[in-house]
């Protein structure tokens, strides 16, 4: 059996070397001479020769200083043989523990640590964490037991101890109130890490703390009184520019100004913020009326995009706005006038009177009327009174000028102000129908094939309105019924079917068709019929010689 006591060896030992560690013995040495040897890391494998053994005595020796931070434990195997070389023992594992010396100082993981904290942060607020490491043994010794301390703070304002550091964790926290970005935006701390719980080897690093902005400063008007003027009736006109200062970080929500007009119930003004310089731009939201009010005194408050973080007084400014009088156009009452009149209204008779009111009540002005648009030239107006009468016959069926039975004319009223101002009114003449149009066929040119002709549908059109329209009555006249027949195509008799009574030769025929409306207004229309060299349904074919009354006549 082996006799091997526990083995430990301090690192960094002085010589002389080799130095005895322990004596290994096998109790087989009582039976005869025993020879010892060792194998393993530090003996016969790298690092080779750190450990040796005296062959005959069994003294295990170290040949050089050890470094725990490189190899903390060596595992060797001891061997015992008799003089004839036979093993007298099984190999035995030997563990050599290298004991630590405080030969490594702490090292910070960064040279500079960066952190941030909101201004106004309360004591106890965590800011950041610094970390150091130590290569020494932190299990069996205090050689790697690091303690953190703050060595210095720059600036030392408003207190030299604004921050504290947790000795064990390296967490830096706020310890004193009074962090103010606007006064001291950054702090530089020199922090120390020392082993042996702060009593041993030490090192330092820098912690840079940025104080971040909160909305703890209000925007302040400078100046607080403004004057401006604006012409009446003009919207979106800049009146004046409001100036503010805000100590908070520029171009952040805590700095950006929001303007509110405190006494603008009518919503006549608006203040927008210039995003570049934070100015307030006061403009008219709608046109102002000088005749109603000549001056406005506005109270404008300014806040930020985000709420104040602390209780702050809202800054206000006073703006005096003078409204300037301008000459305004006369206003027609109503702006659009509807008048019902029969289309057979007598020429030269007065239809209506259409007048305008002068908005400039502080000026005595004369209004003159004239017709601006009268596309059919049906109307005339008295320039002094605005009385409108007809100068020509009205026609509801003049579809170029009349839409949906309505004729639209534009009337203008001009004052004698400086400069002259003109207002426009719209006159809508609703023309009631009279039965002044007889029905007409559509189309008037019809094509048939000579062979197997297909009947053709003819629509009956009447420009009038019911009851002066359908049902219509159709009748062939002047001998057309000899060769042609017609029949109604629908119950309302708004279309007819025309077909030849017999085979007709290629050529052009004229058919006289009498159409009458529901009120017995009639008209005879000549249909132009072409019989073409084709079979079945006709398209369009070239014209030949005309044939009267549906009968071809020799040339």
């Amino acid at each position: 059996d082996w006799v091997i006591p526990p083995i430990s060896c301090p690192e960094n030992e002085k010589g002389p070397f080799p130095k005895n560690l322990v004596q290994i013995k096998s109790n087989k040495d009582k039976e005869g001479k025993v020879f010892y040897s060792i194998t393993g890391q530090g003996a016969d494998t790298p690092p080779v020769g750190v450990f040796i053994i005296e062959r005959e005595t069994g003294w295990l020796k170290v040949t050089e200083p050890l470094d725990r931070e490189r190899i903390a434990t060596y595992t060797l195997f001891s061997h015992a043989v008799s003089s004839n070389g036979n093993a007298v023992e099984d190999p035995m594992e030997i563990l050599i523990t290298v004991t630590d010396q405080n030969d490594n100082k702490p090292e910070f993981t960064q040279e500079v640590f960066k952190g941030s904290v909101m201004e106004g942060a309360l004591p106890g607020t965590s800011v950041m964490e610094v970390t150091a490491t130590d290569a020494d043994d932190d299990v069996n010794t205090y050689n790697a037991a690091i303690a953190y301390t703050i060595l210095s703070q720059d600036p030392e304002l408003p207190d030299k101890n604004m921050f504290t550091i947790n000795r064990n964790t390296g967490v830096i926290s706020v310890v004193t109130t009074g962090l103010d970005r606007e006064s001291f935006p950054t702090y530089t701390l020199v922090v120390q890490a020392a082993d042996l719980q702060g009593e041993g080897l030490s090192t330092t690093a820098t912690a840079v703390i940025t104080v971040t902005d909160t909305n703890d400063n209000p925007p302040i008007f400078n100046p607080t009184t403004y004057k401006g003027q604006v012409p009446e009736n003009e919207a979106n006109v800049v009146i004046t520019t409001l100036k503010v200062t805000d100590a908070d970080a520029p171009n952040t929500p805590a700095w950006e100004a929001v303007y509110t007009i405190l006494n603008d119930d009518g919503g006549q003004f608006v203040v927008t913020t210039n995003p570049v310089n934070n100015d307030g731009i006061l403009k008219t939201a709608k046109g102002l009326d000088f005749e109603a009010k000549q001056q406005y005194i506005l109270h404008v408050a300014v806040t930020n995009v985000v709420p104040f973080e602390v209780s702050l007084t809202t800054s206000t400014a006073t703006v005096t706005v003078d409204v300037l009088d301008v000459n305004e156009a006369p206003i027609f009452v109503p702006p659009e006038k509807r008048v019902e009149v029969s289309e057979d209204f007598g020429v030269g008779q007065e239809i209506t009177s259409y007048t305008a009111q002068e908005p400039d009540t502080f000026m005595e002005q004369k209004i003159t009327y004239r017709i601006w648009r009268d596309t059919a030239n049906w109307l005339e107006i008295n320039p002094d009174t605005g009385a409108i009468s007809t100068r020509a016959e009205l026609d509801r069926e003049d579809f170029e000028h009349v839409k949906n039975s309505t004729y639209t004319a534009l009337i203008i009223a001009t004052d004698n102000g400086s400069p002259v101002a003109t207002g426009t009114g719209t006159l809508l003449l609703i023309l009631s129908d009279v039965n002044d149009n007889a029905p007409i066929p559509e189309p008037r040119t019809i094509f048939f094939c000579e062979r197997n002709p297909k009947p053709q549908v003819i629509n009956i059109i009447d420009a009038d309105l019911p009851p002066n329209t359908s049902p219509f009555t159709a009748e062939l006249t002047h001998g057309a019924s000899a060769n042609w027949t017609i029949q109604y195509n629908d119950p309302t008799q708004e279309s007819i079917i025309l077909k030849p009574k017999m085979a007709l030769e290629v050529g052009d025929y004229k058919i006289n068709l009498k159409l009458m409306d529901n009120q017995n207004k009639d008209q005879v229309t000549t249909l132009e019929v072409s019989v073409c060299d084709c079979e079945g349904a006709a398209g369009v074919c070239r014209k030949a010689q005309p044939v009267e009354a549906g009968l071809q006549i020799p040339a």
Epitope: C449, E450, R451, N452, P453, P500, M502, A503, E505, D533, C534, E535, G536, A537, Q552
Partner: antibody, heavy 120, light 106 residues
Amino acid sequence: QVQLQQPGAELVKPGASVKLSCRTSGYSFTSYWIHWVKQRPGRGLEWIGRIVPNSGGTKYNENFKNKATLTVDKSSNTAYMQLSSLTSEDSAVYYCTREDSYGPFDLDYWGQGTSVTVSS
Amino acid sequence: QIVLTQSPAIMSASPGEKVTITCSASSSVSYMHWFQQKPGTSPKLWIYSTSNLASGVPARFSGSGSGTSYSLTISRMEAEDAATYYCQQRSTYPYTFGGGTKLEIK
């Protein structure tokens, strides 16, 4: 019933003329148009032309414009076709046919045909 | 003038067999009409306006087509159908006939 009667045959000399008749009965002669069609032995049908009995208006195939002349006699309800300057090429059966141009053509009637032989 | 080309010129069919005769026009026509002619007799109107059977024509006959392509079909050939068939166009003057198709019974 509707009938179109034609002579059975005509023998004529080259260079001469012949007038073929087509006597109609059983319908209103002036209400329907008369067409003439040629068929040479073992050959197909060739349209010669048509006449409108009511007006006398005619329409010819260009190939027969100087060969055939169409006429009618309304009093006898008869249609005629005169063929002139006859040659052996004119030897054929000639049919008259009544066409209902106005309608969908389902009332076409044909004569029995006249066989014309041109020979010296 | 419009030229009508019939095919085939001659054909024979067994009783009960389906027969189709085609007629091609050199220009588009509105309708095609068909005539039947047996030796020694006048032609008879057989199909008018492309697809309508003339009076007395058996229902086994049919016609179809449009534009420049038309056909006459016998669904089941019978001995009495042996004859020459002509197509005709009346869409424009002069009227023209096809060259004829002689249909024989096998």
